[in-house]
Interface confidence: low
Amino acid sequence: AVDLTLLANLRLTDPQRFFLTCVSGEAGAGRGSDAWGPPLLLEKDDRIVRTPPGPPLRLARNGSHQVTLRGFSKPSDLVGVFSCVGGAGARRTRVIYVHNSPGAHLLPDKVTHTVNKGDTAVLSARVHKEKQTDVIWKSNGSYFYTLDWHEAQDGRFLLQLPNVQPPSSGIYSATYLEASPLGSAFFRLIVRGCGAGRWGPGCTKECPGCLHGGVCHDHDGECVCPPGFTGTRCEQACREGRFGQSCQEQCPGISGCRGLTFCLPDPYGCSCGSGWRGSQCQEACAPGHFGADCRLQCQCQNGGTCDRFSGCVCPSGWHGVHCEKSDRIPQILNMASELEFNLETMPRINCAAAGNPFPVRGSIELRKPDGTVLLSTKAIVEPEKTTAEFEVPRLVLADSGFWECRVSTSGGQDSRRFKVNVKVPPVPLAAPRLLTKQSRQLVVSPLVSFSGDGPISTVRLHYRPQDSTMDWSTIVVDPSENVTLMNLRPKTGYSVRVQLSRPGEGGEGAWGPPTLMTTDCPEPLLQPWLEGWHVEGTDRLRVSWSLPLVPGPLVGDGFLLRLWDGTRGQERRENVSSPQARTALLTGLTPGTHYQLDVQLYHCTLLGPASPPAHVLLPPSGPPAPRHLHAQALSDSEIQLTWKHPEALPGPISKYVVEVQVAGGAGDPLWIDVDRPEETSTIIRGLNASTRYLFRMRASIQGLGDWSNTVEESTLGNGLQAEGPVQESRAAEEGLDQ
């Protein structure tokens, strides 16, 4: 676990003296932007418990591994959740402290509850100031449960949570209905991912048996030791006033750790320092009790005395947790509870012992699960212990199980069982998977299903051109990362294989099956540019583009047009499958939408550089079509149009647009604006005599609407050739909009 401690100073007579300090014992913690990684962060977490805004809190960094939060001006500033984040990369860890108001209506009997998966958790809120209303329990800020006010048992409201699972973890609160949330009792529930005494994926591994109130981490099996204890199993007490994984930190102030709450990484949570208890950690342990929150009992034998910080202090000639072991009896020292080796390796196992008389090499033996006894090949004799080294024959799977180190002297004997896990190096069952390819690189997902045991510590990817006899190229990658094979040849097949390794000596597995991956054809390099575009309707856009002229054949199969609607967060892609195309009609667009438009050349599956983007605003969809359009020839150059306004208008019409086209003609139609929207007739003038014309019209509000029906009418007589149609609404002449 990460060596990270959040200290809360609970001397609450004056909020301005309250402070929180986050201390990291990690190498180089908190140095920020340099090579050591991200800094320590210490902040109030207002996501669940919100308090009235006040002046900003002051953050002060003290050296590289400590940060302190001050500037609390009133008691309500203190209530809520605080968190400290430290450690780098995958070891980044958050430590959480929950602060309750001492004057709240309800107070937690115990703030932090660490339970195992499947346990029943019981949160108990003690009535401090009674109100005769329901009590609301919340989980992570959301309503969870109601208790009637007279459901209190012995002045406490209990919330029972049977069969808890890890998702049940979080901040719980008990609040009287209609009372200030600051008067709530706040709790933190930590649910380990495994049942009692188990850890690891699938919870198959046994915890080492953490001592002195240490908690077994469900992911890595390490003991998270209470403040004031150290060692792999928390077997060793620190000197009074010290904390941290190696007892390297010192409590500030003359009264040592009095009045301080210590919060450690999950699944430990928070407690008083060793030797202290009470809601404000200001009470010394009662006689016979010791440790964090004074939760441990001494029960010293043989004249041992109880020290509230470290437990039993044994008189000369005795040792053991309760001074129950005579110094004459030999003792196995610091034996790991679990060891892991890879199949077919020949590890060395050390076993250290002390005693009077002093153990010698021949008095220490190692027994395998099948009963085979190994004798040590060498021993290191030091003043306080003898360490025997055993060379283990090549391991087989049957060697998994409980081994035993035994020491025997004339003073007696001691033995320590420990578990040996023989792991099978991983072998890929499948070939690696191709994620993306380019002309000179392949992106590969190397981590496939495998036989044998994890965790995977390294992944080696071996590759070479297909049918080649040259040496394999090898790249070593992190198990969680996809691999990019670089500097390859375009349009070339490569044979790719994976080799997996697990931690420890001999952890490399056999190579997995090969697969063929082929690099792509060359990327298109030309960048098109948009020549122009024009709106052909509220949902239609005509786009044209160009390419730079370069010698040689065009590397490309076609073009991809992309329209990005930023408002809706939607992208429209249009494929133009001819590399010779330089124009495209985009239909079915959304009227009234602001689009960002670009075009890029593609070749095989590869896209070239996109053109600089253009911004296009489509007009909004307009009103319905005008009704009952009718045309009537008035002379050899004039035709009168009459119509009725559209129905169900969404707003006032700004103008009408008339389209005039010679029937059967090949030229573009002419558009004429009728700028007096209240009119229902207009005269189109300047037409050619004896000519058949087609007319249709539409209204505009913010955008152009639907076209009306098309009507046909011929001008009269055989007059002179006119200059072109114009429009007159009643007696007024209007210009021509082409």
Partner: antibody
Framework: EVQLLESGGGLVQPGGSLRLSCAAS????????MQWVRQAPGKGLEWFSS????????IYADSVKGRFTISRDNSKNTLYLQMNSLRAEDTAVYYC???????????WGQGTLVTVSS | DIQMTQSPGTLSLSPGERATLSCRAS????????LAWYQQKPGQPPRLLIY???NRATGIPGRFSGSGSGTDFTLTISRLEPEDFAVYYC?????????FGGGTKVEIK
């Protein structure tokens, strides 16, 4: 499988007394809030009493307060209802039910009929 | 106490039809979705169908669905099966005392 089985119902005269029992099995009885709910003939459901896991807290509806007493014996996995001063309007099928979290009734007994009549 | 009103009192429908039952609370209760639906057949105890306004209890078929929040809630049976003809009760459990509605009888037309 959760099972609740009521017993002790029958005919009783107004002003009389009756004690109902509810035997629980198939779950950890001592962890759950238990309650009694009744249903008059042809009528709807009426909750009237709850007891909390330790037995230290009990609640009653106004209609039965002072006349009925709910209790439990966690060692025997049994819920009880002592009914005194019975009235004609107490005639109903009496169900015991287990309260889930946060408060719906997730398991019910088959019910026992109590008839108060002279 | 919070009054729970169910409507209609009786619903006459044929098998295969859709049933929509309504439940209204006289005031909001804590949690806004702390509402359960129960089914009761003659001579049998109630059976939990829905809790949390829309979560189906264990073993309840998918044709039963709940919706609503605040004071208005609905139980919908998408296609009535012969075994669905029964009395349905709603119950709020957010505020003490926990109260039931008067019930809706779904009968064969």
């Amino acid at each position: 499988e959760v099972q609740l089985l009521e017993s002790g119902g029958g005919l009783v005269q107004p002003g009389g007394s009756l004690r109902l029992s509810c035997a629980a099995s198939g779950f950890t009885f001592s962890r759950y809030v238990m309650q009694w709910v009744r249903q008059a003939p042809g009528k709807g459901l009426e909750w009237f009493s709850s007891i909390y896991p330790s037995g230290g807290a009990t609640i009653y509806a106004d209609s039965v307060k002072g006349r009925f007493t709910i209790s439990r014996d966690n060692s025997k996995n049994t819920l009880y209802l002592q009914m005194n001063s019975l009235r004609a309007e107490d005639t109903a099928v009496y169900y015991c039910a287990r309260r889930g979290i946060p408060g719906y009734f997730d398991s019910w007994g088959q019910g026992t009929l109590v008839t108060v009549s002279s | 106490d919070i009054q729970m009103t169910q409507s209609p009192g009786t619903l006459s429908l044929s098998p295969g039809e859709r049933a929509t039952l309504s439940c209204r609370a006289s005031q909001s209760f804590v949690g806004s979705r702390n509402l359960a639906w129960y089914q009761q057949k003659p001579g049998q105890p109630p059976r939990l169908l829905i809790y949390g306004a829309f979560n189906r209890a264990t073993g309840i078929p998918g044709r039963f669905s709940g919706s609503g929040s605040g004071t208005d809630f609905t139980l919908t049976i998408s296609r009535l099966e012969p075994e669905d003809f029964a009395v349905y009760y709603c119950q709020q459990y957010g505020t003490s005392p926990r109260t039931f509605g008067g019930g809706t009888k779904v009968e064969i037309k």
